[in-house]
């Protein structure tokens, strides 16, 4: 039985040539994490295995950064990058969970004036 | 066009270290991971380790770790693997490749080097 | 270590027919194998990944599918090219595996 649950930092908003750390934390279960894969809607961003190590997509190895821990910090933000963002945990045994952020990446004159999103 | 061109055969006697390159063009070079896997003659492949050209960092096989070094040379795109203390069972065909997009898998391979270790 | 096994170690087809290749893997490793296949006194080429995407250039008489523990990959319509050695292999940890291979012949 998957007893686990994944908690992320939700909706979150950032400037636009700034970064963002990407979080998630999976909690309630004694499952071992083998891998996390992290994804922008299907397109896959980076990879971070318990033995191996992390692959990032060659096509954002300019702009992404593993860590920390299990997150993804992505650099030089476009508008470009607002969207939904995936973390996927494969733990053994419980099996897939799968955690959900959205990334609002705003103009430099809107993120001075505070963040759409609260992190709850 | 992606090329990873590999260096010539080596004989190595028992005890010997042996040091093979693997030039890399037709790609940026610190974008891609890059792996070693050996063949013994007639026999199956076998992963050896891998490394990230942009920071050095590595992982190796734990049936390798203390006799590899996966290194890499940024200026001129070469990957380099050296294996000590070789035996005689370390004669084989090695293999650089390259790491795929979407993970730890191998896109592209060298030519291979074969590597004969005999008294 | 992953353990991969692959059946039949050998066969024999007719030209334009289909070829079947299984690779059994001794935990669960979600769609993360590979297949390559290698030509007598040739480099491993890459054919699959993630189980069923079909590398770039290879002809779409491959075909790859399975998850879990079982995979398979498929020759449709088997050419007189398709003579090889082919190889499964897990890239989800260390060390990555490869089966022992299956040599495909014309029969």
């Known amino acids: 039985m998957m007893t686990g649950t994944i908690e992320t930092t939700g909706n979150i908003s950032a400037e636009k040539g700034g970064s963002i750390i990407l979080q998630c934390h999976l909690s309630s279960t004694t499952a071992q994490v083998t891998q996390v894969n992290w994804e922008q809607q299907d397109q896959l961003l980076a990879i971070c295995n318990a033995d191996l190590g992390w692959h990032i997509s060659p096509s954002f190895k300019d702009r992404v950064a593993p860590g920390p821990g299990l997150g993804l910090t992505l650099q030089s933000l476009t508008v470009n990058d607002t969207g939904e963002y995936f973390c996927i945990y494969h733990t053994y045994p419980d099996g897939t969970y799968t955690g959900r952020i959205f990334l609002e990446v705003l103009e430099s004159s809107v993120a001075e004036h505070g963040a759409r999103f609260q992190i709850p | 066009e992606v090329q990873l061109v590999q260096s010539g055969a080596e004989v190595k006697k028992p005890g010997a270290s042996v040091k093979v390159s693997c030039k890399a063009s037709g790609y940026t070079f610190t974008n891609y991971y890059m792996h070693w896997v050996r063949q013994a003659p007639g026999q199956g492949l076998e992963w050896m380790g891998r490394?990230?050209?942009?920071?050095?960092?590595?992982k190796y096989n734990e049936k390798f770790k203390s006799r590899v070094t996966i290194t890499v040379d940024k200026l001129s795109s070469t990957a380099y693997m050296e294996l000590s203390s070789l035996r005689s069972e370390d004669t084989a065909v090695y293999y650089c490749a390259r790491e795929g997009h979407y993970g730890f898998y191998s896109d592209y391979w060298g030519q291979g080097t074969t590597v004969t270790v005999s008294s | 270590d992953i353990v991969m096994t692959q059946s039949p170690d050998s066969l024999a087809v007719s030209l334009g027919e289909r070829a079947t290749i299984n690779c059994r893997v001794s935990?669960?490793?979600?769609?993360?194998l590979a297949w390559y296949q290698q030509k007598p006194g040739q480099s491993p080429k890459l054919l699959v990944y993630n189980a069923k995407t079909l590398a770039e250039g290879v002809p779409d008489r491959f075909s790859g599918s399975g998850s879990g523990t079982d995979f398979t990959l498929t020759i449709s319509s088997l050419q007189a090219e398709d003579v090889a050695v082919y190889y499964c292999?897990?890239?989800?940890?260390?060390?990555?595996?490869f089966g022992p291979g299956t040599k495909v012949d014309i029969k």
């Open positions: 935990e669960n490793i979600y769609s993360y």
């Open positions: 292999q897990h890239h989800y940890g260390n060390p990555l595996t």
């Open positions: 490394i990230d050209p942009d920071s050095g960092g590595s």
